[in-house]
């Protein structure tokens, strides 16, 4: 069956079409073609005698086209008219007709697009920005991409227009990116330059640093403010509510009781129109900025489980200091027989058990210092286990605390052949 | 008048190369509608457009039987085209024609330059 195949099918504009006939029949006498789904000899290409080798253009004939030895018709310098369809009329020698109709879309060749924004400098939680990709193109699909990605899945970014506008709603500072739109058809796609959003926001609540709180007489005061902004802000310094000066640091040297007060950075964005302070507390005080290291005195460092109590007592010639006390990293009293007294000077532990064997150390600390002391080694002993806890295994005598099997209880200095003894007795 | 004016034909051995030229005269072959070609006949073949070009837009064509191993291309300060032929084989063999189509590809054809493919 004799067939028209366009190659390409679809088809940029001034670029070419090749419609390709398959099926020839054989012993033609000529053929023609024509635009449109029908012969209609107003919309004649171009007729073909093969015997004489002689090509008439008819009306539709634009110059453009080129008839191929197979009969197949390349149309060049395509133009958007040329879009629809195509019919070859194969005469063939004994005079019959025989017809077959093609088809092939014209689509522009994509310019390069362009974004432009209803609002160059939007202020974060209070505006919407809309991007238009340019030109309007028809037959086009709209696509935008953020900092080379495709579009985020957000309440706040609306697609409309045919996908030609993207609005970003409430703007954050976070939208700030490169934003590009990309046109698409069938034949080509083009990507505009990046637009970069620059949002205002802030200034955001300051911070000043450094934290610390507490200063020696004859130090130097030296303190920074930082508020994230955009632009950046502009800072002023305030010492117990008087201005100071309008810098992002504040530095006095040498300082003394008297510069004990409040200070408080502002922060001013003017583009945004919007200012925040932040209020720290500086204290000048002559406390010890050398904390000595306190020693622990114990009343025993080897005890009996279950039977003996101990005193640990946290020394320190320091004065104004607090006392905090440490067993396994882990702040103490961490039991109802743990006990803190003498201003937490001493711990005391009655009675003592197995699961308070381990290291102990204390900290002595004042507001602007502290120091801490080496650990001491508590060992807790067990002179006897109760026969309950005692079962044997494979001839093997374990420990079973309460929650089950323990590994072999190797205890200090426990008497293992009276222990055994007692058990063998008891079986 | 057109004119087409082929030259560069003559023996190669299987595997050799020809590059074949087409002068023109009459006609600027840059020009945005227009398009040069190489025919060639064969004893006992149909005839076969081998290579097109538009010089205008550098468009090319070519017979799926000469795909790879020709290349078609012009001289437009020349007004010329050619036809670079690598890797003849002996079914090469044949009339070549320079061709510019008007209407059809019979429209003007040149003289030809005979091309022989044998060892």
């Known amino acids: 069956k004799l067939t028209i195949e366009s190659t390409p099918f679809n088809v940029a504009e001034g670029k070419e079409v090749l419609l390709l006939v398959h099926n020839l029949p054989q012993h033609l006498f000529g053929y023609s073609w024509y635009k449109g789904e029908r012969v209609d000899g107003n919309r004649q290409i171009i007729g073909y005698v093969i015997g004489t080798q002689q090509a008439t253009p008819g009306p539709a004939y634009s110059g453009r086209e080129i008839i191929y030895p197979n009969a197949s018709l390349l149309i060049q310098n395509i133009i958007q008219n040329d879009t629809g369809f195509y019919t070859l009329h194969v005469i063939k020698s004994d005079l019959v007709n025989e017809e077959a109709t093609g088809q092939f879309r014209v689509y522009p060749e994509l310019p390069k697009p362009s974004i432009s924004s209803n609002n160059s400098k939007p202020v974060e939680d209070k505006d919407a920005v809309a991007f238009t990709c340019e030109p309007e193109t028809q037959d086009a699909t709209y696509l935008w991409w953020v900092n080379n990605q495709s579009l985020p899945v957000s309440p706040r970014l609306q697609l409309s227009n045919g996908n030609r506008t993207l609005t970003l709603f409430n703007v954050t500072r976070n939208d700030s990116a490169s934003y590009k739109c990309e046109t698409q058809n069938p034949v080509s796609a083009r990507r505009s330059d990046s637009v970069i959003l620059n949002v205002l926001y802030g200034p955001d609540t300051p911070t000043i640093s450094p934290s610390d709180t507490y200063y020696r007489p004859g130090a130097n005061l030296s303190l920074s403010c930082y508020a994230a902004s955009n632009p950046p802000a502009q800072y002023s310094w305030l010492i117990n509510g008087t201005f100071q000066q309008s810098t992002q640091e504040l530095f006095i040297p040498n300082i003394t009781v008297n510069n004990s007060g409040s200070y408080t950075c502002h922060a001013n964005n003017s583009v945004t129109g919007c200012n925040r302070t932040t209020v720290k507390t500086i204290i000048v005080t002559e406390l010890s900025p050398v904390v000595a290291k306190p020693q622990i005195k114990a009343s025993k460092t080897t005890v009996t489980g279950d039977k003996d109590s101990v005193n640990l007592t946290c020394s320190t010639n320091d004065t104004g200091i607090s006392i905090r006390w440490f067993f396994k990293n882990q702040s103490l009293p961490s039991s109802e027989r743990m006990k803190l007294s003498q201003g937490n000077i001493t711990l005391s532990i009655n009675p003592v058990k197995r699961e308070d064997a381990g290291t102990y150390w204390c900290e002595v600390f004042n507001p602007i210092s502290k120091n801490q002391s080496d650990p001491i080694m508590l060992n807790v002993n067990y002179n006897a286990l109760p026969q309950e806890n005692l079962i044997n295994v494979d001839e093997q005598l374990y420990f079973q605390g309460g929650s089950g099997l323990n590994d072999i209880f190797e205890a200090q200095k426990i008497e293992w052949h009276e222990a055994r003894a007692h058990h063998h007795h008891h079986h | 008048e057109v004119q087409l004016v082929e030259s560069g034909g003559g023996l190669v051995q299987p595997g050799g190369s020809l590059r074949l030229s087409c002068a023109a005269s009459?006609?600027?072959?840059?020009?945005?509608?227009?398009?040069i070609g190489w025919v060639r006949r064969a004893p006992g073949k149909e005839e076969e457009l081998v290579a097109s070009?538009?010089?205008?837009?550098?468009?090319?064509r070519y017979a799926d039987s000469v795909k790879g191993r020709f290349t078609i291309s012009c001289d437009t300060s020349k007004n010329t085209a050619y036809l670079q032929m690598n890797s003849l084989r002996a079914e090469d063999t044949a009339v070549y024609y320079c061709?510019?189509?008007?209407?059809?590809?019979?429209?003007?054809w040149g003289q030809g330059t005979t091309v022989t493919v044998s060892s």
């Open positions: 061709a510019h189509p008007r209407y059809t590809w019979y429209d003007y």
């Open positions: 009459g006609f600027n072959i840059k020009d945005s509608s227009t398009y």
């Open positions: 070009i538009s010089c205008s837009r550098g468009n090319t």
